[in-house]
Interface confidence: medium
């Protein structure tokens, strides 16, 4: 039977001559040669030779572990004359035996990472890895220990793990924000005589919210005009946060100050500044100056760093309103007088007044628009606004004047303003009452007494305040007439009344009454209508049949007596 | 002035995928943070999903209907975002918009949008 | 997940009209409450940030106020421009809408 066990050879053998492997021996083998040893396998006749004769084993070539750890060969024993086998066939192994010639190798160069300022001290910032090619069941030759060459005292690595954490307290990203750390893997469990390799990591510390916003300047000062629409931009101010992205982030906005009802501040987006602005129409005469408090905060708080005070900061703001010269201001939107219309030339009506709202209190003169008086009718004294009439007025004519009165800076034309004059004509009773229309009216020849023919109706162009009042009467020439009579009714209409039985048209065929109409206002008014009478041939229910003159003619034409 | 202008919408089956590209104009890009935002015919709106800028880490969220089937990736050297929209549905079936997320957690600028049909 | 509660869902005015659209939180946001305008065919436009800031270059008639969980957004004289589609929005945790307020004519 065969006579070995598995054989062992160190790796990396650095002998001249052949490294001896081991001898393979068969209890048939009585040493005189009439034993053949055969060698077939792995690397059999090239990397593993064998003396026929002896059975020894060598190795031609140096050998490496790591390519290679387990050599499977067969071993032959025969009859070197017949050639046949003196021993069955058999398997054996050669294993490479491990030595310390690999270093740990990491898994990348370089390696990235980041991890939040002010974290709290073992922190992870993230887990490097070497490994080593040599053999992990047999000695430290792949034990590998993790240690920090460069990076404290801000960060450490454990040992065994290769977790990489911070090691110091309140590390500030506004102070630095990149580290370079060196991470070495040593293998022998780190002991003397080791191999080892390194590897970078490249830390970055990641923006918190540990910085408030701080304006670099206690107050501002800006101008604007008391013109400025709302809306205007008047001014900027930034303050600033030493923190980055949304940690910085600023909002604006005014917290105190009498002005926090007229301005506003807005924040500008692409440039963190806060924008003043006018909120509400300015006015020079009533403030020159504003007084605003305005705060800057943080948005995005982290509530772990409220204990380094408010995140936020106060300014003030002084906002300096400059003066804009403004056209005269008049005492009312609109003026309304009122004139009697028997007003004489040069009558003053009434008056306006406007002035200077500028500081400077410019005088004003004032002036008619005559585009809007085309007629002349109004003047205005130029100094004291007094409006006189130039001509004379008619209230039926025209009830209401409407004017502009025009009021000019002297000192600067450019500056003027203008207001409505209405200007209302007060009735006078200067006009007669009349007829309403012209009246003709008939009588039947068969007429009897007391029989009214005709109502009278008045009108009047005056408008007095307590109403018409007419009254009528025949004129004194024909107030004793026997044929017609008046009857006033007192409600401004009267009746032609018959005062006789039957009329004649052969001997009269027209009458003409004159009749007075007065008014009841001061001074009285009153003028003298005529009504037409026709004596006229009737049927039996009084209708008209004919009105023909036939009777015969006074000289003068038709009679006047009633 | 500010400019948003998304482009890639189109009719696609269910299971498909899709690319929105939204080129950005007017403003410093690389320092804003940019949203999704979608509208079904007819419906209100939606957040899509968010990526943040380069000083916040290029940090992205998005709402549970999309997680995991929408990426959202920027280009600042291009002034373009995009969202690459994969295993459709038909319920994906809107406008997409895309919104310049202001400071205070506000859309101050938007695109006109861009529809997107799921259709079989 | 924050919800928004918005209403009315819609409304009718006339021009001139004041308007007031309530949103409410199913939790407390602080002040991170944004109100938005949309008309049909358009993307949304910011009209109020944080509760009561108003947006540059929206009216002042547009006014929004609250805090914690109830915001209000007012339009105190209402014009024909302003018929739309309002939203509100939170901010507090990542973002959801409310649902919308339709401003119609009367």
């Known amino acids: 039977s065969w006579m070995w066990n598995q054989f062992f050879l160190l790796e990396e053998y650095t002998g001249s001559d052949y490294q001896y492997v081991g001898k393979l021996h068969s209890d048939q083998d009585r040493g005189d040669g009439s034993l053949k040893y055969i060698l077939s396998g792995d690397g059999a006749g090239d990397l593993f030779i064998i003396n026929e004769n002896t059975g020894d084993i060598q190795a031609t070539k140096r050998l490496d572990r790591e390519e290679k750890p387990v050599y499977i060969l067969r071993a032959q024993a025969v009859n070197r004359r017949t050639g046949r086998p003196v021993e069955p066939e058999s398997e054996f192994i050669i294993k490479i035996h491990d030595i310390n010639d690999n270093e740990p190798i990491f898994t990348k160069d370089v390696y990235t990472a980041t991890v939040p300022e002010m974290a709290d001290v073992g922190t992870f910032v993230v887990q490097v890895t070497a490994t080593d090619a040599d053999d992990p069941t047999y000695g430290n030759s792949a034990k590998v220990v993790y240690s920090i060459l460069q990076g404290q005292p801000y960060f450490s690595v454990e040992s065994e793990t290769g977790i990489i954490k911070t090691a110091l307290l309140n590390m500030d990203r506004e102070n630095r924000e990149q580290y370079q750390v060196v991470i070495q893997a040593k293998d022998m469990g780190g002991q003397m005589g080791g191999l080892s390799g390194t590897t970078t990591v490249n830390i970055t510390l990641t923006d918190v919210n540990d910085n408030p916003p701080r304006f670099p300047q206690s107050t501002y000062q800006f101008k604007t005009p008391e013109s400025s629409p709302p809306g205007t931009p008047i001014g900027r101010i930034k303050a600033s946060d030493a923190d980055v992205g949304e940690n910085a982030e600023i909002e604006y906005s005014i917290t105190d100050g009498e002005g926090h009802e007229m301005f506003d501040v807005i924040t500008d987006q692409e440039t963190q500044e806060g924008i003043i602005t006018v909120k509400k129409l300015l006015d020079f005469e009533k403030k020159k100056v504003y007084t605003l408090k305005v705060e800057a905060s943080n948005p995005h708080v982290e509530p772990r760093f409220l204990y380094l005070g408010p995140f936020k900061d106060s300014a003030t703001v002084r906002i300096v309103v400059d003066d804009v010269d403004e056209p005269p201001v008049f005492s009312k939107l609109a003026y309304i007088l009122q004139i009697r219309e028997d007003a004489r030339i040069n009558t003053t009506i009434g008056s306006v007044a406007a002035q200077d709202p500028d500081a400077a209190r410019n005088p004003v003169k004032y002036s008619v628009d005559r585009h809007t008086d085309m007629d002349r009718i109004f003047n205005i004294d130029s100094g004291n606004g007094s409006i006189f009439t130039s001509k004379l007025l008619d209230r039926e004519t025209l009830l209401w004047h409407n004017i502009t009165v025009i009021a000019t800076e002297i000192n600067n034309p450019k500056q003027s303003s203008r207001v409505p004059l209405y200007i209302k004509v007060l009735d006078v009773n200067d006009n007669a009452p009349e007829f309403a229309e012209f009246y003709e009216t008939f009588v039947c020849e068969k007429a009897k007494a007391d029989q009214l023919i005709q109502t009278l109706r008045a009108v009047d162009k005056d408008d007095p305040y307590s109403g018409h009042q007419f009254s009528f009467s025949l004129a004194p020439e024909a107030a004793s007439s026997s044929n017609f009579t008046i009857q006033d009714n007192k409600d401004n209409t009267a009746g032609i009344l018959t005062r006789k039985n039957g009329y004649n048209r052969h001997e009269m065929s027209t009458y003409l009454l004159p009749v007075v109409i007065s008014d009841n206002d001061y001074p009285v008014q009153s003028s003298t209508g005529t009504v037409t009478v026709r004596v006229c041939a009737c049927d039996h229910h009084g209708n008209m049949q004919s009105c023909h003159a036939e009777a015969l003619i006074h000289p003068t034409g038709l009679s006047t007596g009633a | 002035q500010v400019q948003l202008v998304e482009s890639g919408g189109g009719l696609v089956k269910p299971g498909g995928s899709l690319r929105l590209s939204c080129a950005a104009s007017?403003?410093?890009?690389?320092?804003?943070?940019i949203s999704w935002v979608r509208q079904a015919p007819g419906k209100g709106l939606e957040w899509v999903g968010f990526?943040?800028?380069?000083?916040?880490?290029?940090?992205?969220n998005y709402a549970a209907p999309v997680k995991g089937r929408f990426t959202i990736s920027r280009d600042d050297s291009k002034n373009t975002l995009y969202l690459q929209m994969n295993s459709l549905k038909t319920e994906d079936t809107a406008v997409y918009y895309c919104a310049r997320i202001r400071y205070f957690r506000n859309w101050d600028y938007w695109g006109q949008g861009t529809l997107v049909t799921v259709s079989s | 997940d924050i919800q928004m509660t918005q209403s009315p869902s819609s409304l009718s005015a006339s021009v001139g009209d004041r308007v007031t659209i309530t949103c409410r939180a199913s939790?407390?946001?602080?002040?991170?409450l944004n109100w938005y305008q949309q008309k049909p065919g358009k993307a949304p436009k910011l009209l109020i940030y944080?509760?009561?800031n108003l947006q540059s270059g929206v009216p002042s008639r547009f006014s929004g106020s609250g805090s914690g969980t109830d915001f209000t957004l007012t339009i105190s004289s209402l014009q024909p421009e302003d018929f739309a589609t309002y939203y509100c929005?939170?901010?507090?945790?990542?973002?959801?809408f409310g649902q919308g307020t339709k401003v119609e004519i009367k």
């Open positions: 939790q407390t946001i602080n002040s991170y």
């Open positions: 929005q939170q901010g507090d945790s990542s973002w959801t």
């Open positions: 944080r509760a009561s």
């Open positions: 007017g403003f410093t890009f690389s320092s804003y943070a």
């Open positions: 990526i943040k800028s380069n000083a916040d880490g290029y940090t992205t």
